[in-house]
């Protein structure tokens, strides 16, 4: 039975040209995290494997940095970066947990927000 929950930064905003840290946290489970995949809608941004470390997808290498921790830093933001981001936790023995973050990249200076929450499901 999957008892864990993913906490995320929820809905966040950042300025064009700036950077943002995407963070998720898995709690309420003793399952071992074997890998975390970071995805942007339909694209794979990066994989953090518990043993092997980080692999940043080649198309994002110039503006994605690993960390802090299991998080991901997006740099040189453009308005096209606005959208949904997902952290996918591969765990043993539970299976897969998914958290969602919505990023809005603003053209000019403006207020930012932080939220919480997330959801989880299991891939068979």
């Amino acid at each position: 039975m999957m008892t864990g929950t993913i906490e995320t930064t929820g809905q966040i905003s950042a300025e064009k040209g700036g950077s943002i840290i995407l963070q998720c946290h898995l709690s309420s489970t003793t399952a071992q995290v074997t890998q975390v995949n970071w995805e942007q809608q339909d694209q794979l941004l990066a994989i953090c494997n518990a043993d092997l470390g980080w692999h940043i997808s080649p198309s994002f290498k110039d503006r994605v940095a690993p960390g802090p921790g299991l998080g991901l830093t997006l740099q040189s933001l453009t308005v096209q970066d606005t959208g949904e981001y997902f952290c996918i936790y591969h765990t043993y023995p539970d299976g897969t947990y998914t958290g969602r973050i919505f990023l809005e990249v603003l053209e000019s200076s403006g207020g930012g927000g932080a939220g919480g929450g997330g959801h989880h499901h299991h891939h068979h």
């Epitope: 074997t34 890998q35 995949n37 995805e39 339909d42 694209q43 794979l44 994989i47 494997n49 043993d51 092997l52 470390g53 980080w54 692999h55 997808s57 080649p58 198309s59 591969h90 891939h123």
Partner: antibody
């Protein structure tokens, strides 16, 4: 230039233990990367067996986990595979390979030439 | 376990022609796919990683494409040394799996 070379008995009896080593030249296996075993039954596709990371951690294919041990011999710059309780289904060409995860993800970029192991009495 | 299914099992092509090989994943693997070439009696050779990036020293006639569950390896103009078996592999999950292979033979 990194080179990998498998060695070990070409014939193992059923219920016995298959033991292979992979000698690595051109790179110290305790300096980086992960070091893998992959097998290929005659006329069939490839199956990942498991790896040892340079840090010493290991990870195995769940379907083989109960029978597999992969370890490193630092002094000889080689790593080994032990597969216990073998049956005819374990007859295959066994390859060792290197994975540069940071650059190429889970793709294996250097391979040994492979060694055929037959399980038969 | 993510199952990778390759088609066709055998592809007959004349030298100089284009070859298109297919690989389908049983679930979404984004772009975490590699392609290998294997000739008889030899080890696999890495061609493509991250679905579309050529490995060092691989000729430009080899190209990979796709995302999600459907992937393609294209050899634009087959040379005599390209007749071999080709395998796809996924590394989206922590248990890496390979396809069954496509044999490219001379027509």
């Amino acid at each position: 230039q990194v080179q990998l070379q498998e060695s070990g008995p070409g014939l193992v009896k059923p219920s016995g233990t298959l033991s292979l080593t992979c000698a690595v030249s051109g790179y110290s296996i305790t300096s980086g990367y992960s070091w893998h075993w992959v097998r290929q039954p005659p006329g069939k596709g490839l199956e990942w067996i498991g790896y040892v990371h340079y840090s010493g951690s290991t990870n195995y294919n769940p379907s083989l986990k109960s029978r597999v041990t992969i370890s490193v011999d630092k002094s000889k710059n080689q790593f080994s595979l032990k597969l216990s309780s073998v049956t005819a289904a374990d007859t295959a060409v066994y390859y060792c390979a290197r994975m540069d995860y940071g650059n190429y993800g889970g793709a294996m970029d250097y391979w040994g030439q492979g060694t055929l192991v037959t399980v038969s009495s | 376990e993510i199952v990778m299914t390759q088609s066709p099992a055998t592809l007959s092509v004349s030298p100089g022609e284009r070859a298109t090989l297919s690989c389908k994943a049983s679930q979404d693997v984004r772009t975490a796919v590699a392609w290998y070439q294997q000739k008889p009696g030899q080890a696999p050779r890495l061609l493509i990683y991250s679905a579309s990036y050529r490995y060092t020293g691989i000729p430009a006639r080899f190209s990979g494409s796709g995302s999600g569950t459907e992937f393609t390896l294209t050899i634009s103009s087959l040379q005599s040394e390209d007749f071999a078996v080709y395998y796809c592999q996924q590394y989206y999950s922590t248990q890496w799996t390979f396809g069954g292979g496509t044999k490219v033979e001379i027509k």
